[in-house]
Interface confidence: low
Amino acid sequence: SERCDDWGLDTMRQIQVFEDEPARIKCPLFEHFLKYNYSTAHSSGLTLIWYWTRQDRDLEEPINFRLPENRISKEKDVLWFRPTLLNDTGNYTCMLRNTTYCSKVAFPLEVVQKDSCFNSPMRLPVHRLYIEQGIHNITCPNVDGYFPSSVKPSVTWYKGCTEIVNFHNVQPKGMNLSFFIPLVSNNGNYTCVVTYLENGRLFHLTRTMTVKVVGSPKDAVPPHIYSPNDRVVYEKEPGEELVIPCKVYFSFIMDSHNEIWWTIDGKKPDDVPVDITIIESVSYSSTEDETRTQILSIKKVTPEDLKRNYVCHARNAEGEAEQAAKVKQKVIPPRYTVELACGFGAT
C-alpha cells in the first residue's frame, strides 16, 4: 500500500477512562496534527479507519464494531465505548486515507478501576481556589457530548466518599459545585457522578478532581529570606565545616516561578575554586505557600573561604530579595603556657 504519514504514538494524550462507564474519544489527527477538520476530510472523500493494539501485544487488529449493543461504535471522528471494559486498554490508531493520501496517529487508552470511594490510578486535575475570597464554582468536567441537551441527567457530588449535603460552605447545583469563602478545610478530592439514560440503559460518568485552597493574590508578596540574617554569625576555624542555610518563604502566586540561589563573591558557586555542596529542599503549607531551602556546605573551610562574601538570592513574580551571610574566622585566644627555660650560663 501507499506510504502513510505516521505521527507515531502520541503520548501527550495518555487517555484514562473508568471501567464500566461510557467513553468518547476523538481522533487526535484533527485536533493536533492536521489543518482541516473531519467534515472537510470526509467531504473530500477521505475515510477514517480505527484499529488497535491490545495491552502487551504487538499485533494491530481491527476494532470489533459488531459487539452486542454496539458496545464500541464510531460516530464521525469519535470512537465510542458504551461502556468500557478493563481489557479495552491498549494503543488505538486512527487513520485517514483514500487511494492517494494517508495519515495516521496512535494514542494510549488506559481503562482504570475505581473503588467505592472513587480512589483510582486516574491522574486528577487540580482546581485552585483562593482562600477566604468570594464564591468559586467548579463544573463537572468532560461530560459534553455524552448525551443530548434534551436529556437532563442526575448529578451527585461527593467529597471523598461522602455525598455533599448540608455542607457548611459548599453547595451543589446540577453540574456546578459552589464554594462560598473557601477555607483550607475544603481541600480534598471532589467527585461528580452524572447518571443518564440512553435507549433504556443507565450510564454513569464519574469525574474526580482535587481542590486546593491556596493563598490569595492579595496576600502575594516578594520572597522573604528567613536565613541567613543579621542575627546569626557563622564563625568558624579553618578546617571546620561551614554550613549556611538559605531559607526563603514564597507566598502562593499562581504560575509563579520561585527560585533561590547562592552567589560567592558575586559569582555562581560553580565558578569559584571551592569544594562546595548545595542541597535543596522544598516544603509547602496547606495553602501552597512554599518554603525553599538551599544548604551550602564547605567540608573543610580555609581562611580564604572565610573572607568570601556569601549571598542568598530569591525571586518570584512579585520581586527579588537578597541577604548576605555573616561569615568570619573564629579568633583563637592565645594559649598561656609556663615555659621553664633551663639556661646554661655562658661564661
Epitope: P68, E69, E163
Partner: antibody, heavy 120, light 107 residues
C-alpha cells in the same frame, strides 16, 4: 440508621384502587432514586416502578403501565404508589427500596413490605 | 425485556459445603448485576452489586463473578444462617429484572 417503612396495604376488590406510602429516614432522600418491588405469595421478586431524585423521570414494568403511578414528596421524605384498576395478579407484598450507587438500579435498603390483596 | 435465568431452582447442601448459583442474562448486561438473600417473611438483603462487589457487612464467604451474560454467586463454606432464597437482578436496562430465585435448603 437508614429506614424505609411501607404502609397502605390491605384488601381491595378487582378494579379498585389503593395508595401505598413509604416513609424514609436516616439518609438524604432527595439524592436517591427510589423503587417499588413486589413479591406475589410464594413467588419471586418483581420490580414494579422507580422514580428519579427530583421526580422528573419514572419507569414502570409493562404489566402496570397506565394503571400505577409512582410519585414522591422530597419535603416529606416519602414515596408513593397509586394503584388503580387492580387485578388479582397484583396481589403481593410491596416493598419500598432505595436504589444504591447513584441510581444504578440495585437495591441497598428495603422496607419490610406491605401486603396488598386483590380479591372479591 | 431482558430475561434472567437462575439455576438451579432448588439446591440441597450441608454446612461447610461450597455452593455455586448461576444466573444467565438473555443479552449482555456488562457487570450490572446484583445478588440478594431473602429469608421467609423478611425483606431481601443485598449481598453483591456490580457483579462482584461485596456489600458492606456481608461475610467474605460470599463472592460474585462474571460479566456479559454469565454470572455466579459462590458461598465458599455454607453456614447455618445461609439457608435462604437467593435472587439475581440485572440493572443495566429498564426494566430491572430479577431471576426466578434459587432456594438453598439443608440436605
Amino acid at each position: 440508621e437508614v429506614q424505609v417503612v411501607e404502609s397502605g396495604g390491605g384488601l381491595v376488590q378487582p378494579g379498585g384502587s389503593l395508595r401505598l406510602s413509604c416513609a424514609a429516614s436516616g439518609f438524604t432522600f432527595r439524592s436517591y432514586w427510589m423503587s417499588w418491588v413486589r413479591q406475589a405469595p410464594g413467588k419471586g421478586l418483581e420490580w414494579v416502578a422507580n422514580i428519579k431524585q427530583d421526580g422528573s423521570e419514572r419507569h414502570y414494568v409493562d404489566s402496570v403501565k397506565g394503571r400505577f403511578t409512582i410519585s414522591r414528596d422530597n419535603a416529606k421524605t416519602s414515596l408513593y404508589l397509586q394503584m388503580s384498576s387492580l387485578r388479582a395478579e397484583d396481589t403481593a407484598v410491596y416493598y419500598c427500596a432505595r436504589e444504591g450507587y447513584f441510581g444504578s438500579g440495585y437495591f441497598d435498603y428495603w422496607g419490610q413490605g406491605t401486603l396488598v390483596t386483590v380479591s372479591s | 425485556d431482558i430475561q434472567m435465568t437462575q439455576s438451579p431452582s432448588t439446591l440441597s447442601a450441608s454446612v461447610g459445603d461450597r455452593v455455586i448459583i448461576t444466573c444467565r442474562a438473555s443479552q449482555s448486561i456488562s457487570r450490572g448485576l446484583a445478588w440478594y438473600q431473602q429469608k421467609p417473611g423478611k425483606a431481601p438483603k443485598l449481598l453483591i452489586y456490580k457483579a462482584s462487589n461485596l456489600e458492606s457487612g456481608v461475610p467474605s464467604r460470599f463472592s460474585g463473578s462474571g460479566s456479559g451474560t454469565e454470572f455466579t454467586l459462590t458461598i465458599s463454606s455454607l453456614q447455618p444462617d445461609d439457608f435462604a432464597a437467593y435472587y439475581c437482578q440485572q440493572y443495566s436496562y429498564y426494566s430491572h429484572t430479577f431471576g426466578q430465585g434459587t432456594k438453598l435448603e439443608i440436605k
